[in-house]
Structure formats: structure tokens, C-alpha cells
């Protein structure tokens, strides 16, 4: 199943995807689409690159802010809304028949909550639940495999709503995580 990345409404979401150009500088076309990667190309294309640059964007909110020329084709979606939630496909279109690399990533957009969890709860949340928090301008540089989590310092305010905080607190207590 896809790795999940979480962003708050109004924040920027970061969906990682990368490849290693071989040889360096030998870029290949990439498309990002809304929906799981289909057999061919991308469905509902939101952004497309050619061998040189981004040549198709369906909205000014979609950006490649990483080092595109080194194969970092991670997608940044600015000012996300609940409608941006869902699975996205990053397709690295390597020449040849059926050579494409396909990566499905899931974006979960949440409403800003009215409460701020304690710092330790923030950290424990990230260690107890293998989902990426992607509220900053940039996120982890590499695609994570399901179940893994980069050891990054996450500062997320207004994370979940009160009910979710309560539920997660109980789950963390059951899992042995520290709660203060």
C-alpha cells in the first residue's frame, strides 16, 4: 500500500519522488497525476516534465522545488485543501517498453485543530504512527518505504482535532509511548 503523507489545510504538502539520472544530467520525462498509477502515462495529470523542464502544470499550486536536474522530482502542493486528499502517482518515464518507475503516494489533508499537543506527544505521535508529516516547505528527501519514518525533527502544531488527540493518546498509552 502507499505511504501516507499528512498536511494541514492551508499548508504546503510535500510528496517525495526521485530517481538517479544515468548518466548524470540525462533527464527523463516525469508525470504526476491524481489517482493511482495506471498502466500507461498518468491519469489526471497535475504536472509533467520533459527532458529539460516542467512543461505542463494544471495549477500554479503544483511545483517541483527540489533539484530537478539531479532527479529530485518531489511534488509540492501549495495551500492544500481537503479536495487535494487522495493517491498521487509519480511516474518516471524511462525509455523502453514497460520500463517506467511508478510510485503511488497518499496525501491526507487534515483540518487545523484547535488544540496544540505537547511537544513530547508530537514526537511520540510520529514514532508510533508510520505516516509522514508534511506541513513544512520541504520534507524528507527520499521516498520512504511503507512502515519506515525518517528521523527528522517535526514541529507540527494543531495536529489532530481534540477527539483524535484523545484517541491517539490512548493508543500511545497502550503502545507504551511516553505521554505528558
Amino acid at each position: 500500500s502507499e505511504v501516507e503523507y499528512i498536511a494541514e489545510v492551508g499548508q504546503n504538502a510535500y510528496l517525495p519522488c526521485s530517481y538517479t539520472p544515468a548518466p548524470p544530467g540525462n533527464l527523463v520525462p516525469v508525470c504526476w497525476g491524481k489517482g493511482a498509477c495506471p498502466v500507461f502515462d498518468c491519469s489526471n495529470v497535475v504536472l509533467r516534465t520533459d527532458n529539460r523542464d516542467v512543461n505542463d502544470r494544471t495549477s500554479g499550486r503544483y511545483w517541483l522545488k527540489g533539484d530537478f536536474h539531479k532527479g529530485d522530482v518531489s511534488l509540492t502542493i501549495e495551500n492544500v485543501t481537503l479536495a487535494d486528499s487522495g493517491v498521487y502517482c509519480c511516474r518516471i518515464q524511462i525509455p523502453g517498453i514497460m520500463n517506467d518507475e511508478k510510485h503511488n503516494v497518499k496525501l491526507v489533508v487534515i483540518k487545523p485543530a484547535k488544540v496544540t499537543p505537547a511537544p513530547t506527544l508530537q514526537r511520540d505521535l510520529t514514532s508510533a504512527f508510520p505516516r509522514m508529516l508534511t506541513t513544512g516547505e520541504h520534507g524528507p528527501a527520499e521516498t520512504q518505504t511503507p512502515g519506515s519514518l525518517p528521523d527528522v525533527n517535526l514541529t507540527v502544531s494543531n495536529f489532530f482535532c481534540e477527539l483524535q488527540i484523545f484517541t491517539l493518546t490512548n493508543e500511545l498509552r497502550d503502545s507504551g509511548a511516553t505521554i505528558r
Epitope: G35, C37, V39, F40, D41, V87
Partner: antibody, heavy 116, light 107 residues
Framework: EVQLVESGGDLVQPGGSLRLSCAAS????????MTWVRQAPGRGLEWVAN????????YYVDSVKGRFTLSRDDAKNSLYLQMNSLRAEDTAVYYC?????????WGQGTLVTVSS | ETVMTQSPATLSVSPGERATLSCRAN??????LAWYQQKPGQAPRLLIY???TRATGFPARFSGSGSGTEFTLTISSLQSEDFAVYYC?????????FGGGTKVEIK
């Protein structure tokens, strides 16, 4: 108005060849994947082959690989399917369709009958 | 290959009634599923794509739902022009495959 018009269907003997054509109009042909889908008489639909916008990649269902060749001529807004070593099981109406994964416009079809 | 199974093969419905058509995949196809309508002597017409997005030209009485392996096409109130054969098609796995079709006929 988008239009796709197939031609070239005929009665042919097993082992024979045919070339189907699809003339496209009403859209920018060169920016779309194009596809052939077939339907045997009284039967369901079967995807046959498709071709990328620039012609750099062509894909075929296993049952026609090595026998059918897909090509396009963007200057003529046309799609072609060269069918060799035809078999009785290739008998079908062949539809030209626009798209790669799902197909939003279809032609009226051309009937290919393979029989001795 | 991904096998798409449609049921029932034939559905007899009276005009004005609701019709529910099922399509099942033998492996996950996410929401990469389309529905087509085909009338006798005509080419298929795209009806639904991405499991639930209605194509241009079809009214709101047609709706698609489901993801993964189970999908449904619902026609809320059948009109005379809706009697046809309906095919589902997955585009998640190689090769692209269609279901065998469901014929919706007048009861």
C-alpha cells in the same frame, strides 16, 4: 467535433494481411495516445494495442505480438494497424479509440473477417 | 492478467426502476476503472472513468462507486435510452482488460 473513422476492414484468408486506417479530426491528434480495441461478433471488448503521442512506445496484447504493427502519421492525423499472419480468432470489429488507459472517443469500427 | 467479472450477465428492469451493475477484479485496481455503454450496432461510449467520474454527455442518474476490487454502476431511474450493454474496464494492471458485459434489458 471529435471524429474517428476507421477503414480497411475486409474478408481475408487465414495467414493473410490487412492494413487498417483511422482518420482523426476535431482534436490535436499529435498530443494524444491512440488505441485499437476489437470486438468479436457477439462478444465482449478486447484491448489490442496502443501508441504514445510521439510514437516512441507501442504496446500490444500478447495474442497479436509479432503479427500486428501499430504506427501513426501525425502530419496526416492518421493511425494505422498492419495485421499479418491473420487467424480466424482475429475476426472482429476493430475500433480506433482516443486515449491510453480509458477511451473517451471511438470510431464506428471496421469489420475484419478471417475465413477460408 | 487481471480478470474482470461482471454480474449479472443480464439484468431485466422496468423503466423508472433502479439498476445496479457489479464489476469485480481478481486483484487490486485501485480506482483505475472505467465503464462504457454500448448500444446495438454502435461503438462503445465512455460513461465513467476513475471509478466514479462521469464522462461528458451522461446525466446524473448514472453513478459509479467502489475501489480496489469491487465496483458498482448505478442507474437511479432507468430511461428507455439506457437499455444497452455495459462494460467495465480496468487500467491499473497490464494488460488492459474488460469485463464480459452486463446487458440491461426491458422487463
Amino acid at each position: 467535433e471529435v471524429q474517428l473513422v476507421e477503414s480497411g476492414g475486409d474478408l481475408v484468408q487465414p495467414g493473410g494481411s490487412l492494413r487498417l486506417s483511422c482518420a482523426a479530426s476535431g482534436f490535436t491528434f499529435s498530443t494524444y495516445w491512440m488505441t485499437w480495441v476489437r470486438q468479436a461478433p457477439g462478444r465482449g471488448l478486447e484491448w489490442v494495442a496502443n501508441i504514445k503521442q510521439d510514437g516512441s512506445a507501442k504496446y500490444y496484447v500478447d495474442s497479436v505480438k509479432g503479427r500486428f504493427t501499430l504506427s501513426r502519421d501525425d502530419a496526416k492525423n492518421s493511425l494505422y494497424l498492419q495485421m499479418n499472419s491473420l487467424r480466424a480468432e482475429d475476426t472482429a470489429v476493430y475500433y480506433c479509440a482516443r486515449g491510453s488507459n480509458w477511451f473517451d472517443y471511438w470510431g464506428q469500427g471496421t469489420l475484419v473477417t478471417v475465413s477460408s | 492478467e487481471t480478470v474482470m467479472t461482471q454480474s449479472p450477465a443480464t439484468l431485466s428492469v422496468s423503466p423508472g426502476e433502479r439498476a445496479t451493475l457489479s464489476c469485480r477484479a481478481n486483484q487490486n485496481v485501485y480506482s483505475n476503472l472505467a465503464w462504457y455503454q454500448q448500444k446495438p450496432g454502435q461503438a462503445p461510449r465512455l460513461l465513467i472513468y476513475d471509478a466514479s467520474t462521469r464522462a461528458t454527455g451522461f446525466p446524473a442518474r448514472f453513478s459509479g462507486s467502489g475501489s480496489g476490487t469491487e465496483f458498482t454502476l448505478t442507474i437511479s431511474s432507468l430511461q428507455s435510452e439506457d437499455f444497452a450493454v455495459y462494460y467495465c474496464q480496468q487500467y491499473n494492471n497490464w494488460p488492459l482488460t474488460f469485463g464480459g458485459g452486463t446487458k440491461v434489458e426491458i422487463k
